[in-house]
């Protein structure tokens, strides 16, 4: 009686269980009663990443430099190429099909996490006691200057965008 289900690494065709091709190889011909499944390796710029019965391999992804992309990991016959973005850019999606420039943190905000090829800059508001007076993709919030340690006094309070202004202490008249 012909099988209705096949074991792992097999597929059902013409009432018969045939062996699947291993990752990295494509189907050339199905098995018969007398012959095994025939498979051949994918070409130089192709891959198949699963046990399969595909008659064509998939093309490796192209990391287009015009879109700011570069190769992070070269593809093999079993894996696709992995793209990442050039310096100063990050991917717009998980599949990394194009890149955009990293966001800068505006004055009053500092960099919480520097951007990578796959993630954008994460900014955070400068808390009390810290400031950022520049628009930057790298700079963290900096602490206000401590006037006391310089034997000075605060002449102008700091904000999240400006440092405190220190000045000399008023000498008390005799």
């Amino acid at each position: 009686e012909p099988p209705t289900a096949c074991r792992e690494k097999q597929y059902l065709i013409n009432s018969q269980c045939c062996s699947l091709c291993q990752p990295g190889q494509k189907l050339v011909s199905d098995c018969t009663e007398f012959t095994e499944t025939e498979c051949l390796p994918c070409g130089e710029s192709e891959f198949l990443d699963t046990w399969n019965r595909e008659t064509r391999c998939h093309q490796h992804k192209y990391c287009d430099p015009n879109l700011g992309l570069r190769v992070q990991q070269k593809g093999t016959s079993e894996t696709d190429t992995i793209c990442t973005c050039e310096e100063g850019l990050h991917c717009t999606s998980e599949s990394c099909e194009s890149c955009v420039p990293h966001r800068s943190c505006l004055p009053g905000f500092g960099v919480k996490q520097i951007a990578t090829g796959v993630s954008d800059t994460i900014c955070e508001p400068c808390p009390v006691g810290f400031f950022s007076n520049v628009s930057s993709a790298f700079e963290k919030c900096r602490p206000w200057t401590s006037c006391e340690t310089k034997d000075l006094v605060v002449q102008q309070a700091g904000t999240n965008k400006t440092d405190v202004v220190c000045g000399p202490q008023d000498r008390q008249r005799a």
Partner: antibody, heavy 121, light 107 residues
Framework: QVQLVESGGGLVKPGGSLRLSCAAS????????MSWIRQAPGKGLEWVSY????????YYADSVKGRFTISRDNAKNSLYLQMNGLRAEDTAVYYC??????????????WGQGTLVTVSS | SYELTQPPSVSVSPGQTASITCSGE??????ICWYQQKPGQSPVLVIY???KRPSGIPERFSGSNSGITATLTISGTQAMDEADYYC?????????FGGGTKLTVLG
């Protein structure tokens, strides 16, 4: 019974050339993918090259790429290995073998007796 | 380049079960063949596609493959099974052999 017989081995100087032949009998040669495998004295098996039924798909080991050429003549039931630029490390017994199916689903189910190639000055 | 690693030698008493391993990265993602080679002879295919036996190969030869290890098992080992055993797989567009394991049947 199914038979593969290699010939053409011998002593050759480094940089020299040799052409190995493998004569197939008692099976339909054109139905099978074929390989050359070698074994250095006292060492393990090393795959050399692979050719499809029609000869349109060919693979080589990195160690012989650009120096060795595999070919076949289905009308003569013969497999060949042209070896140029021979080096001392090519010294080995060379086997031709039949693959029971294309690619990884197969296995080399019939081997010749081997022919010895010695590269020495 | 891809490598298959085998123990250089395995010993077994007659009638016992011999297990020869072959390990490699993502090996379970490949089909494995096993060859037997006796001194002065050409190799003989004993297992292909992980577990299939060509005609004429005794039932005491069996194979399995999972994860990073493939195993050739010879149950009820006989003196005539003493030989070198090689695993083999395809990787990309090349065929790769393991370094071989010498099986010694004691006694």
């Amino acid at each position: 019974q199914v038979q593969l017989v290699e010939s053409g081995g011998g002593l050759v100087k480094p940089g020299g050339s040799l052409r190995l032949s493998c004569a197939a009998s008692e099976f339909t040669f054109s139905d099978y993918y074929m390989s050359w495998i070698r074994q250095a004295p006292g060492k393990g098996l090393e795959w050399v090259s692979y050719i499809s039924r029609s000869g349109d798909t060919i693979y080589y080991a990195d160690s012989v790429k650009g120096r060795f050429t595999i070919s076949r003549d289905n009308a003569k039931n013969s497999l060949y290995l042209q070896m140029n630029g021979l080096r001392a490390e090519d010294t080995a017994v060379y086997y031709c073998a039949r693959d029971l199916a294309a690619g990884a689903t197969g296995g080399l189910d019939c081997w010749g007796q081997g022919t010895l190639v010695t590269v020495s000055s | 380049s891809y490598e298959l690693t085998q123990p250089p030698s395995v010993s077994v008493s007659p009638g016992q079960t011999a297990s020869i391993t072959c390990s490699g990265e993502r090996l379970g993602n490949k089909y494995i063949c096993w060859y037997q080679q006796k001194p002065g002879q050409s190799p003989v295919l004993v297992i292909y596609q992980d577990f299939k036996r060509p005609s004429g190969i005794p039932e005491r030869f069996s194979g399995s493959n999972s994860g990073i290890t493939a195993t050739l098992t010879i149950s009820g080992t006989q003196a005539m099974d003493e030989a070198d055993y090689y695993c083999q797989a395809w990787d990309s567009r090349t065929v790769v052999f393991g370094g071989g394991t010498k099986l010694t049947v004691l006694g």
